[in-house]
């Protein structure tokens, strides 16, 4: 597969990662395939200074991140593991909160207004953030 | 200039297979997410599949899902679309289409002039 | 999936008139909405993307409008050439989807 140099045209450059930020809403599943269909991913937060990155760029938004517990445990998309990994969470979060009376809990995990950490309802049309790593190789399957 | 130039389409009976090709010219293919639409005879246009720009990541209609397959050679400025299990109701000529750098959506701005398959036994 | 209707399904105005259809998306779309034009045996051109922009080389005539769920496409002054079917389509979500067709016809 071949590599990628740069980032593309609307997408910032930060620490060897290219970032896209959404100005319209959509539910977690369907903001995971608009950025898999970037041949990227939702974004992965793995340090205190690439949340505030993020943070700053998106702004006082609900925004979808790329961590969700729809499976059971809480997972990264990219496979980064969530035990060892950064977190930060509002107080008391997450919740699977189920007094929203939408059916079922809540299995997405979204920036808030202040930046921390919240599980909400993953059919909620919240902006979205899609992440891809510089010089990695693209997946794609080598030519016989 | 851009264009989109389909092939592969003809008459197969139902249960066979037909690959479609889609050459490209005129723009870097390789930094384009590519479409397959489709419109029956007398009816209107129905999307079946999506491919990222890479082609590790794609997308297909229900009504296609698990017998149609889109996958493109960025090092031949090609897409395909390999129909398997054909049924009458396939029919339909066939078009390539590039998708838009409109950010947030999957919009299509180019489309190439079509490919006729023909299902019937 | 995202149904979008498009009204009328057909048609007949003068040379000179002024055409308007409609599409209603139903669920809020945003602004990602295409207008095509179809004529007999040919492809779909592409005429207006993001609700209201006019795709380059398009006739000034043409315009889009609309957000959200309820969109609107006119002609402000048919020509004879604009005989064709045209579509709305939605791309926001997966699948996408697109209106059932509006054919216009001249009287």
């Known amino acids: 597969g071949s590599e990628r140099t740069c980032c593309p045209v609307n997408w910032v450059e930060h620490e060897r990662s290219c970032y896209w930020f959404s100005r319209s809403g959509k539910a977690w599943a369907d903001a995971d395939n608009y950025c898999r269909l970037e041949d990227a991913h939702l974004v992965v937060v793995t340090s205190w200074e690439e949340q505030k990155f993020v943070q700053h760029h998106i702004g006082p938004v609900n925004t979808w991140m790329g961590l969700h517990d729809q499976n059971g445990p809480w997972k990264w998309v990219d496979g980064t593991d969530y035990e060892t990994g950064f977190k930060n969470w509002r107080p008391e979060q997450p919740d699977d909160w189920y007094g929203h009376g939408l059916g079922g809990g809540e299995d997405c995990a979204h920036f808030t207004d202040d930046g921390r950490w919240n599980d909400d309802v993953c059919q909620r049309p919240y902006r979205w953030v899609c992440e891809t790593e510089l010089d990695k190789a693209s997946q794609e399957p080598p030519l016989l | 200039q851009v264009q989109l130039v389909e092939s592969g389409g003809g008459v197969v009976q139902p249960g066979r297979s037909l690959r479609l090709s889609c050459a490209a010219s005129?723009?870097?293919?390789?930094?384009?997410?590519m479409h397959w639409v489709r419109q029956a005879p007398g009816k209107g246009l129905e999307w079946v599949a999506v491919?990222?720009?890479?082609?590790?990541?794609?997308y297909h209609a229900d009504s296609v899902k698990g017998r149609f397959t889109i996958s493109r050679d960025n090092s031949k400025n090609t897409l395909y679309l390999q129909m398997n299990s054909l049924r009458a109701e396939d029919t339909a000529v066939y078009y390539c289409?590039?998708?838009?750098?409109?950010?947030?959506?999957?919009?299509?701005?180019?489309w190439g002039q079509g490919t006729t398959v023909t299902v019937s036994s | 999936d995202i149904q979008m209707t498009q009204s009328p399904s057909s048609l007949s105005a003068s040379v000179g008139d002024r055409v308007t259809i409609t599409c209603q998306a139903s669920?809020?779309?945003?602004?990602?909405l295409n207008w095509y034009q179809q004529k007999p045996g040919k492809a779909p051109k592409l005429l207006i993307y993001?609700?209201?922009n006019l795709e380059t080389g398009v006739p000034s005539r043409f315009s889009g409008s609309g957000s959200g769920t309820d969109f609107t496409f006119a002609i402000s002054s048919l020509q004879p050439e604009d005989i064709a079917t045209y579509y709305c389509q939605q791309y926001d979500i997966l699948p996408i989807t697109f209106g059932q067709g509006t054919r216009l016809e001249i009287k």
């Open positions: 005129g723009f870097t293919f390789s930094s384009y997410g």
């Open positions: 993001d609700a209201s």
């Open positions: 669920q809020d779309i945003y602004n990602y």
């Open positions: 289409v590039r998708r838009s750098s409109s950010s947030g959506g999957y919009g299509m701005d180019v």
């Open positions: 491919i990222s720009y890479g082609g590790s990541n794609k």
